[in-house]
Amino acid sequence: GIAIPRNSGCPNSEDKNFPRTVMVNLNIHNRNTSTNPKRSSDYYNRSTSPWNLHRNEDPERYPSVIWEAKCRHLGCVKADGNVDYHMNSVPIQQEILVLRREPRHCPNSFRLEKILVSVGCTCVTPIVHHVA
Amino acid sequence: GIAIPRNSGCPNSEDKNFPRTVMVNLNIHNRNTSTNPKRSSDYYNRSTSPWNLHRNEDPERYPSVIWEAKCRHLGCVKADGNVDYHMNSVPIQQEILVLRREPRHCPNSFRLEKILVSVGCTCVTPIVHHVA
């Protein structure tokens, strides 16, 4: 992380070294005030690479519920509704941060964890591997 | 959050109410051991709704660098390389959790924050609004 001089008004902290334990306020501030969640809510159905959303729940994690996209087809949907297998539906994946209760079941102690989630799908031209 | 009985081995915590302040170990555990990041690294170019990645940096945030996708076209790219305006490239957005330094510049005190990021783009059939 970037070294930032500590303000005199900062909460005291014993351990300045990594791995460091920090105080986190779980009262979430939501920056997405201007976004309309309904806008993109049906892309999973309208896409040429449609996907289904699967609920992944883990009470030891924060957030406990994460939605995972699974592409419906191997190919992409054409104008006539049929699947074109000369194109590929692939998941767009993103690494996200979650909080993992550590030790387990402790309500006030967490460790940051990186997990890879599939957010949606996109239609790509397949890579052609030439036969030697 | 889900109420979980506290173990006797859990770190002590004064405030059990929301907004609650918790201890978080920033030594990130990475669960993505089996994933190959190169697999999806070129989807942004091979997609029918290609995108560019823009670096969003904020030293007051953890992680300080987030990559934002911006669709290259309004339409989608056809097999011949031309753009089809009767389909739309749209960003797939996801709400993610980040840590925001609070008070500002404090190295050991954070607040959880939700931000909306565009992860990639997908090609969708446009919504037809009937002309009044």
Epitope: - | Y85, H86, N88, H129
Partner: antibody, heavy 119, light 112 residues
Framework: QVQLVQSGAEVKKPGSSVKVSCKAS????????ISWVRQAPGQGLEWMGV????????DYNQRFKGRVTITADESTSTAYMELSSLRSEDTAVYYC????????????WGQGTLVTVSS | DIVMTQTPLSLSVTPGQPASISCRSS???????????LHWYLQKPGQSPQLLIY???NRFIGVPDRFSGSGSGTDFTLKISRVEAEDVGVYYC?????????FGQGTKLEIK
């Protein structure tokens, strides 16, 4: 009713830039795309590009690529067209038009903005 | 780019008489999703273009039924069954099937 109101006439020097605005009203700004079309004096119509105001995604006529930038401000329901490196041949009336997928074209047009490029 | 060629370039018609304008595209305007995005506009003197016909044959709101459009593929026609004085101006065909969208060079209609 649907209205697109454009900014006033401009006189510009060769090599400079011009930014024309198009304020939309009477409908939900992010539901429709905005196209820009120009018409040189006594000439026909030439399509310049289009924007999806919801996400700011654009596509341009390659003839103008690199010189034209189309943007939109959702908070004021206004679209903008900026043309740089102006030359005398860019003297024209510039129109914005609301594109909809029902008609498949620009059904409602602004009143036009005359841009004169002269030294 | 798709080239749109209109004929004739000018037309002088007696009120009450029919008029016909032809438009030919350099490539088929039928989209893979089935529609043909060929449209007709009228630009009256000193005004912005106004949509008359969209997708070959559909009259836009408020357009009199004396205007009709027809055609397919690369050949299209705009017909005015009985020309009126208010119909004067320049008529443009336009395609939005292919990028970039293009217009015909225009047909000027005058009243005799």
């Amino acid at each position: 009713q649907v209205q697109l109101v454009q900014s006033g006439a401009e006189v510009k020097k060769p090599g400079s830039s011009v930014k024309v605005s198009c304020k939309a009203s009477g409908y939900s700004f992010t539901d429709y795309h905005i196209s820009w079309v120009r018409q040189a004096p006594g000439q026909g119509l030439e399509w310049m590009g289009v924007i999806n105001p919801e996400y700011g995604t654009t596509d341009y006529n390659q003839r103008f690529k690199g010189r034209v930038t189309i943007t939109a401000d959702e908070s004021t329901s206004t679209a903008y067209m900026e043309l740089s490196s102006l030359r005398s041949e860019d003297t024209a009336v510039y129109y914005c038009a609301r594109y909809d997928y029902f008609t498949g074209t620009g059904a409602y047009w602004g009143q036009g903005t005359l841009v004169t490029v002269s030294s | 780019d798709i080239v749109m060629t209109q004929t004739p370039l000018s037309l002088s018609v007696t009120p009450g008489q029919p008029a016909s304008i032809s438009c030919r595209s350099s490539q088929s305007l039928k989209h893979s999703r089935g529609n043909t995005f060929l449209h007709w506009y009228l630009q009256k003197p000193g005004q912005s273009p106004q949509l008359l016909i969209y997708k070959v044959s559909n009259r836009f709101i408020g357009v009199p039924d004396r205007f009709s459009g027809s055609g397919s593929g690369t050949d299209f026609t705009l017909k005015i069954s009985r020309v009126e004085a208010e119909d004067v101006g320049v008529y443009y065909c336009s395609q939005s099937t292919h990028y970039p969208f293009t217009f015909g060079q225009g047909t000027k209609l005058e009243i005799k």
